[in-house]
Interface confidence: medium
């Protein structure tokens, strides 16, 4: 969990397409567990940007205290700033809430760089631009933190949307979404459309801009184009999936597919980058370098330490390749691919030298904890977290940044054999795997 990359910023057999197309089981979309169609009240309820996280407005306590909360599918605690901090404009004041209940228990969450700690309690929580319900949820009141809150990010807490298995201090602490589903009639599903701006936003622009949508309890057709393709959730802890093949500009990386998922592959809105295991990262960078060799970039760029800049409006998108990740499909021996553009993996940076320049950070980085499909991937797609059916859906986002020549894509089916072999089985120990 790396600060600056993980938010808070913490920032072989693999199955070749055989040219064979499997028929869809049906031309109809499968029946969804949630309401379908229009969720007008929830559309555009997120703000922010990939580098500092996407947040939703929530209210906590009685009378309601409004806070902006980072949407994080890579953790499972609902935690909010509950004490003054130089980077917080406001914080949760438990003493002002008549419905706050103290659980008399502490929680400590360390990251590779930074940490937060706090006190556990419960209170009434609602989402103004969400379902019209109020739930009693567990809240970690953050009393102390280091390198957790981000200056200028405009959020004051974090909404961990993953499963109880990775909740802190242990899996007995029910995550917010579980509480929501148990206490209301909201279907056990949410979907995210994260909209990267494609250009850097200054502070006032972020506050005025739309960052995307979190649809709680359903799927909104207006947020995507084409079909939704689903990949199984391998295990309910993180949102773990299986990648079976990786291509750069259509060229297979030709690695044993286990490498792509070593030691896991997760979908994480709280991470900025596409993070890849060391071997995969090195192979991918080598391939991206080769594909974009008409221009040379320093090593520092590929390591995320240097920006690359062009005069405003002259970024040569065409020299950079598309990246395709093939995901295990719902049908045996069937996969589908999601394809992102350089507009997703070259992240515009606001702290540019001058407004005459467009500067970018390479938003693919190395990981020691498996593949993390962070905001740069999610910004290309509408992503459905169908917890009820233990699957994650991908469709091309209606707001993804592209150019007149190329667009992000979700395509399938492809025949891919022995996909189960692509999953890595993490040795079970008593050690927590979360301190990453």
């Amino acid at each position: 969990t790396q600060h600056g990359i993980r938010l808070p910023l913490r920032s072989g057999l693999g199955g070749a397409p055989l040219g064979l197309r499997l028929p869809r089981e049906t031309d109809e979309e499968p029946e969804e567990p949630g309401r379908r169609g229009s969720f007008v009240e929830m559309v555009d309820n997120l703000r922010g940007k990939s580098g500092q996280g996407y947040y939703v407005e929530m209210t906590v306590g009685s009378p309601p205290q409004t806070l902006n909360i980072l949407v994080d599918t890579g953790s499972s605690n609902f935690a909010v700033g509950a004490a003054p901090h130089p980077f917080l404009h406001r914080y949760y004041q438990r003493q002002l809430s008549s419905t706050y209940r103290d659980l008399r228990k502490g929680v400590y969450v360390p990251y590779t760089q930074g940490k937060w700690e706090g006190e556990l309690g419960t209170d009434l929580v609602s989402i103004p631009h969400g379902p019209n319900v109020t739930v009693r949820a567990n809240i970690a009141a953050i009393t102390e933190s280091d390198k957790f809150f981000i200056n200028g990010s405009n959020w004051e807490g974090i909404l961990g949307l993953a499963y109880a298995e990775i909740a802190r201090p242990d899996d007995s602490l029910e995550p917010f979404f579980d509480s929501l589903v148990k206490q209301t009639h909201v279907p056990n599903l949410f979907s995210l459309q994260l909209c990267g701006a494609g250009f850097p936003l200054n502070q006032s622009e972020v506050l005025a801009s739309v960052g995307g949508s979190m649809i709680i309890g359903g799927i909104d057709h207006s947020l995507y184009t084409g079909s939704l393709w689903y990949t199984p959730i391998r295990r309910e802890w993180y949102y773990e999936v299986i990648i079976v093949r990786v291509e750069i500009n259509g060229q297979d990386l030709k690695m044993d597919c286990k490498e792509y998922n070593y030691d896991k592959s997760i979908v994480d809105s709280g991470t900025t980058n596409l993070r890849l295991p060391k071997k995969v990262f090195e192979a991918a960078v080598k391939s991206i370098k080769a594909a974009s060799s008409t221009e040379k970039f320093p090593d520092g760029f590929w390591l995320g330490e240097q920006l690359v800049c062009w005069q405003a409006g002259t970024t040569p998108w065409n020299i950079f390749p598309v990246i395709s990740l093939y995901l295990m499909g719902e049908v045996t021996n069937q996969s589908f691919r999601i394809t992102i553009l350089p507009q997703q993996y070259l992240r515009p940076v606001e702290d540019v030298a001058t407004s005459q320049d467009d500067c970018y950070k390479f938003a693919i980085s190395q990981s020691s904890t498996g593949t993390v499909m962070g905001a740069v991937i999610m910004e290309g797609f509408y992503v459905v977290f169908d917890r009820a059916r233990k699957r994650i859906g991908f469709a091309v986002s209606a707001c993804h940044v592209h150019d007149e020549f190329r667009t992000a894509a979700v395509e399938g089916p492809f025949v891919t054999l022995d996909m189960e072999d692509c999953g890595y089985n993490i040795p079970q120990t008593d050690e927590s795997t979360l301190m990453t």
Partner: antibody
């Protein structure tokens, strides 16, 4: 809008001291190099000193080494030039200029001093 | 220190003339050479960076070329507003050094 505003110039006696300030706005000060360049009356440009706030790296022209000190306060986005043991030949208009550091790689190469202040006059005379 | 020798030190030309100013470095500075224009009482303005790249907003009649030790600034068709002093500067090695300047005057 990018701006560099120098201040602190004036008349000083030989052997005296003066501190020039360069207040920056409209760009990322931390990842820029700030340079001081001077121009004696009727003469050409002479580079004096530079600092890169993010690395702390400083550099000086031989003519001022040991007498001038460049510094930066990133919280104020301001660079300073502390000038001690001033001599008559230090009389000049002093400009501050900024240059993107190598944190910014231009596919065409690295940029030069692209923004300059209006200058402040330093006169060393008895 | 690297010396930058600029020539000529001054020249007289008419509107519409093609003007060439050269700069020679005492050792190779790769392509890290900039050209500036300065008018009396004003701060210098960047024209060309990294030997040949036109700075944003600078008219296309200005161009730069060269690498290593020999560099050239060319004004393809001199305009009234181009009468000024021009300086080259190497920024490959510290201390950065300027040429002595070329004053372009009206003939």
């Amino acid at each position: 809008e990018v701006q560099l505003v120098e201040s602190g110039g004036g008349l000083v006696q030989p052997g005296g001291s003066l501190r020039l300030s360069c207040a920056a706005s409209g760009f990322n000060f931390y990842y820029s190099s700030i340079h001081w360049v001077r121009q004696a009356p009727g003469k050409g440009l002479e580079w004096v000193a530079s600092i890169s706030p993010y690395s702390g790296y400083t550099s000086y022209a031989d003519s001022v080494k040991g007498r001038f000190t460049i510094s930066a306060d990133t919280s104020k986005n301001t660079a300073y030039l502390q000038m001690n043991s001033l001599r008559a030949e230090d009389t000049a208009v002093y400009y501050c200029a900024r240059q993107p550091t190598h944190y910014y790689y231009y596919a065409k190469g690295y940029k030069a001093m692209d923004y300059w202040g209006q200058g402040t006059l330093v006169t060393v005379s008895s | 220190d690297i010396q930058m020798t600029q020539s000529p030190s001054s020249l007289s030309a008419s509107v519409g003339d093609r003007v060439t100013i050269t700069c020679r470095a005492s050792q190779s500075v790769s392509s890290a050479v900039a050209w500036y224009q300065q008018k009396p009482g004003k701060a210098p303005k960047l024209l060309i960076w990294y030997a040949s790249w036109l700075y944003s907003g600078v008219p296309s009649r200005f161009s730069g070329s060269g690498s290593g030790t020999d560099f050239t600034l060319t004004i393809s068709s001199l305009q009234p507003e181009d009468f000024a002093t021009y300086y080259c500067q190497q920024y490959s090695y510290s201390p950065f050094t300027f040429g002595q300047g070329t004053k372009v005057e009206i003939k």
